[in-house]
Interface confidence: low
């Protein structure tokens, strides 16, 4: 399974949709900026077998899907774009799941890097906590949208590294 090939097109579409979802100028939200501590080291890629790498990517996309599937998200973003974004994420999840099965077989569970997955979970917990504290304000969502765009861009680099490893 050529993971980067199947995944990068969807990643690019998701990034485009995220960009289109922007409703207010980021410059009007500078005071709300926040460092969520993206777990960059987990996306280094050198220490992973491919199945492990896929599981970390899967976790990030699953968490992104969960974040944008909430009631508060539905009340914030333009519904048509949000549905398309969710569609894109779901397609990526399906692709990644198919890749894992191809890599390790249906019966085997890939050797997940639990620490890495936990780091991704905690990253999204910090994002959710920030949104809660900011009472899901438009600026808070704008900051989160920009952060997710950044994390998707970084995961794209991760995929390129995976491709070079092949």
């Amino acid at each position: 399974c050529d993971l980067p090939q199947t995944h990068s097109l969807g990643n690019r579409r998701a990034l485009i949709l995220l960009a289109q979802m922007g409703r207010i100028s980021p410059f009007s939200c500078l005071k709300d900026r926040h460092d969520f501590g993206f777990p960059q080291e987990e996306f280094d890629g050198n220490q992973f077998q491919k199945a492990q790498a896929i599981s970390v990517l899967h976790e990030m996309i699953q968490q992104t899907f969960n974040l944008f599937s909430t009631k508060d998200s539905s009340a914030t973003w333009e519904q048509s774009l949000l549905e398309k974004f969710s569609t894109e994420l779901n397609q990526q999840l399906n692709d990644l799941e198919a890749c894992v099965i191809q890599e390790v077989g249906v019966e085997e569970t890939p050797l997940m890097n639990v620490d890495s997955i936990l780091a991704v979970k905690k990253y999204f917990q910090r994002i959710t906590l920030y949104l809660t504290e900011k009472k899901y304000s438009p600026c808070a969502w704008e900051v989160v949208r920009a952060e997710i765009m950044r994390s998707f861009s970084l995961s794209k680099i991760f995929q390129e590294r995976l491709r070079r490893k092949e």
Partner: antibody
Framework: QVQLQQPGAELVKPGASVKLSCKAS????????MHWVKQRPGQGLEWIGE????????IYNENFKSKATLTVDKSSITAFMQLSSLTSEDSAVYFC????????????WGQGTLVTVSA | QIVLTQSPAIMSASPGEKVTLTCSAG???????LYWYQQKPGSSPKLWIY???NLASGVPARFSGSGSGTSYSLTISSMEAEDAASYFC?????????FGSGTKLEIK
């Protein structure tokens, strides 16, 4: 497999209301938006609106905002559409269709309920 | 709202004939969200082509779809009796989602 079950027909009097049902099975009900579509005899299709079964959020086609009310009952995994102040113009087949992911968008439809408005 | 105009409204084709149905949008539609449905009398619509050019599961390879912007088409390379049906184009690029008025395709 995914199934959307709708009653075959409803006969109602002008001015009355009718509540149509769409019972889902074969998938996680709360994971997909449910849509409703109208088709008058020999005519095209009109999108009425959609509901997110997870939290009940609805989006309507402006043309149907005062006509249709979409609801869900998660316990019975059923979506409903109430049509009010019925006239002959509302006589049509009403389909429920499941939203979805890329190739699964509207890939699953109910059989449709024929609503006849007649005195 | 985006109005989708289909032409012709009704057409007849002989077995083996090449058939092209068109769908013209009143304003630009993102090609990823332009779909086609087939409907036979007394049945629900069936997803036929998604994202402009991808055939849904079980759709014969003689069908194809193409287009971009405001102009889309569904083509049958060689008409067969089982293809006689109504075909609707549909967009979910923007709200409200809309369908074309349909083309009824008959077999000669």
């Amino acid at each position: 497999q995914v199934q959307l079950q709708q009653p075959g027909a409803e006969l109602v009097k002008p001015g009355a209301s009718v509540k149509l049902s769409c019972k889902a099975s074969g998938y996680t009900f709360t994971n997909y938006w449910m849509h409703w579509v109208k088709q008058r005899p020999g005519q095209g299709l009109e999108w009425i609106g959609e509901i997110n079964p997870s939290h009940g959020r609805t989006i309507y086609n402006e043309n149907f905002k005062s006509k249709a009310t979409l609801t869900v009952d998660k316990s019975s995994i059923t979506a409903f559409m109430q049509l009010s102040s019925l006239t002959s113009e509302d006589s049509a087949v009403y389909f429920c269709a499941r939203g979805g992911l890329g190739p699964a968008w509207f890939a699953y439809w109910g059989q449709g309920t024929l609503v006849t408005v007649s005195a | 709202q985006i109005v989708l105009t289909q032409s012709p409204a009704i057409m007849s084709a002989s077995p083996g004939e090449k058939v092209t149905l068109t769908c013209s949008a009143g304003s630009s539609v993102d090609s990823s969200y332009l779909y086609w449905y087939q409907q036979k009398p007394g049945s629900s619509p069936k997803l036929w082509i998604y994202s402009t050019s991808n055939l849904a599961s079980g759709v014969p390879a003689r069908f194809s779809g193409s287009g971009s912007g405001t102009s889309y088409s569904l083509t049958i390379s060689s008409m067969e009796a089982e293809d006689a049906a109504s075909y609707f184009c549909h967009q979910w690029s923007s709200y409200p989602f809309t369908f074309g008025s349909g083309t009824k395709l008959e077999i000669k």
